[in-house]
């Protein structure tokens, strides 16, 4: 039961995380205009990975895409790449993990295959989460560097009384969404990896040895598992334990409504 719960929770947490990474990547508020120096601006700037926007006090908002590819800073390109890699890996991880879920039965897929798929998706989620966290952190670092650079020359004098206020940018909502989403995806991935350990068959596979007494048959199972005693119907040589380290929650007598998609 614990393994299914861990796997299911890992899947859900990762799903939320990847949705968050996608949302963060699409959001326009990666950096927002710092209002410390001009808290009463009637024009508010904010920028995303794909476009920059200006919101006026009139309510009018205008966004312009970055139509150039070569003209963009290398750091921005790197952040874009990290986020996209994170999304792609996360999406593949989700696809794999759906088939790996214990509660979903696909044909006669063995537990070892499900365990491998769970581990694969878990690793993918971990890498996806790390990509998102790295991408957001690189962007945040870029903002901090630019912030202090623009603070150093905040005002550039233009002929005495005329001054140009340089626009400074600070952390936008997308950064926090990205950090949280990346963290959730990472946690989900770790949970999937933990669940994989519970799903994987043990290395040493013991075959059950049956000892027959005159009255009844006793199947003795070495290796620390309980011996099960069969009366009546269990008189023939029967393999009761086949070596797979199964937990109780894996034994499903009847197909349930969750077995098929």
């Amino acid at each position: 039961m614990a393994v299914t719960a861990c796997q299911g929770l890992g899947f859900v947490v990762s799903l939320i995380g990847i949705a968050g990474i996608i949302a963060a990547t699409c959001m326009d508020q990666w950096s927002t205009q710092d209002l410390y120096n001009n808290p009463v601006t009637a024009v508010f700037n904010y920028q995303g990975l794909w476009r920059s926007c200006v919101r006026e006090s009139s309510g009018f908002t205008e966004c312009r895409g970055y139509f150039t590819l070569l003209g963009l800073p290398a750091m921005l390109q790197a952040v874009r790449a990290l986020m996209i890699v994170g999304i792609v890996l996360g999406a593949i991880g989700l696809l794999v993990s759906i088939f790996a879920l214990k509660c979903i039965r696909i044909g006669s897929m063995e537990d070892s295959a499900k365990a491998n798929m769970t581990l694969t998706s878990g690793i993918m989620f971990i890498v996806s989460g790390l990509c998102a966290i790295a991408g957001v952190s690189v962007f945040a670092n870029m903002l901090v560097t630019n912030f202090w650079m623009s603070t150093a020359n905040m005002y550039t004098g233009m002929g005495g009384m005329v001054q140009t206020v340089q626009t400074r940018y600070t952390f936008g909502a997308a950064l926090f969404v990205g950090w949280v989403a990346g963290g959730l995806t990472l946690i989900g991935g770790v949970m999937m990896c933990i669940a994989c350990r519970g799903l994987a068959p043990e290395e040493t596979n013991y075959k059950a040895v049956s000892y027959h007494a005159s009255g009844h048959s006793v199947a003795y199972k070495p290796g620390g598992f309980k011996a099960s005693t069969g009366f009546g119907s269990n008189t023939k040589n029967k393999k009761i334990y086949d070596g797979g380290a199964r937990t109780e929650d894996e034994v499903q007598s009847y197909p349930s409504k969750h077995d098929y998609v």
Partner: antibody
Framework: EVQLLESGGGLVQPGGSLRLSCAAS????????MSWVRQAPGKGLEWVAT????????YYADSVKGRFTISRDNSKNTLYLQMNSLRAEDTAVYYC???????????WGQGTLVTVSS | DIVMTQSPDSLAVSLGERVTMNCKSS????????????LSWYQQKPGQPPKLLFY???TRESGVPDRFSGSGSGTDFTLTISSVQAEDVAVYYC?????????FGQGTKLEIK
């Protein structure tokens, strides 16, 4: 047709209060930022206050800060300017305006005259 | 606060003449985010409320005759009337739309000789 109709102006003594109203019609009032601008007799234009679309943000000229309050009732399509502790220098024609692209004021009411005199 | 200074205070011209009036701001009105200048021009005829002519310094409001043109960037702006008509007699104001408090220039009064 867009229309802005100011009312509530009149003669008031220094230290007194007055509430101006601006009835808007011909457009979706709740979707626009609104402002009050005044013009003293024979003088230039002076921005007084602005209220952002949702009403959550308000901005005031330093000369009226703490004395005037701009508000709006989107259900009634009405903009208000509550003026307290009025001074002689507040004597002016008060215009209600609508903000559009560029935060420019595209529509102005005909104005209401406020006279502060003893 | 951003100070808006208009020049000249008044000018008298003949009909059909070309007119230029200036507006200078104490701070740049150019928004880096969209490369637009947050300055608007208004025309106020005697006994009437002001009328918007231009926003974003050079974008003409609908219904404004094309003899009017707005130009400039940063801190220096110009309103030009290519051929003055009798109905252009008015006071012209420039306004900072960049930050609060919104400030107007003192106005330029246009008269016909």
């Amino acid at each position: 047709e867009v229309q802005l109709l100011e009312s509530g102006g009149g003669l008031v003594q220094p230290g007194g209060s007055l509430r101006l109203s601006c009835a808007a019609s011909g457009f979706t009032f709740s979707s626009y930022t609104m402002s009050w601008v005044r013009q003293a007799p024979g003088k230039g234009l002076e921005w007084v206050a602005t209220i952002i679309i949702g009403g959550s943000y308000t901005y005031y000229a330093d000369s009226v800060k703490g004395r005037f309050t701009i508000s709006r009732d989107n259900s009634k399509n009405t903009l208000y300017l509550q003026m307290n502790s009025l001074r002689a220098e507040d004597t002016a024609v008060y215009y209600c305006t609508r903000l559009v692209k560029g935060s420019a004021m595209d529509y102005w009411g005909q104005g209401t005259l406020v006279t502060v005199s003893s | 606060d951003i100070v808006m200074t208009q020049s000249p205070d008044s000018l008298a011209v003949s009909l059909g003449e070309r007119v230029t009036m200036n507006c200078k701001s104490s701070q740049s009105l150019l928004q880096s985010g969209n490369q637009k200048n947050y300055l608007s021009w208004y025309q106020q005829k005697p006994g009437q409320p002001p009328k918007l002519l231009f926003y974003w310094a050079s974008t003409r409001e609908s219904g404004v005759p094309d003899r009017f043109s707005g130009s400039g960037s940063g801190t220096d702006f110009t309103l030009t009337i290519s051929s003055v008509q009798a109905e252009d007699v008015a006071v012209y104001y420039c306004q900072n739309d960049y930050s609060y408090p919104f400030t107007f220039g003192q106005g330029t009064k246009l008269e016909i000789k």
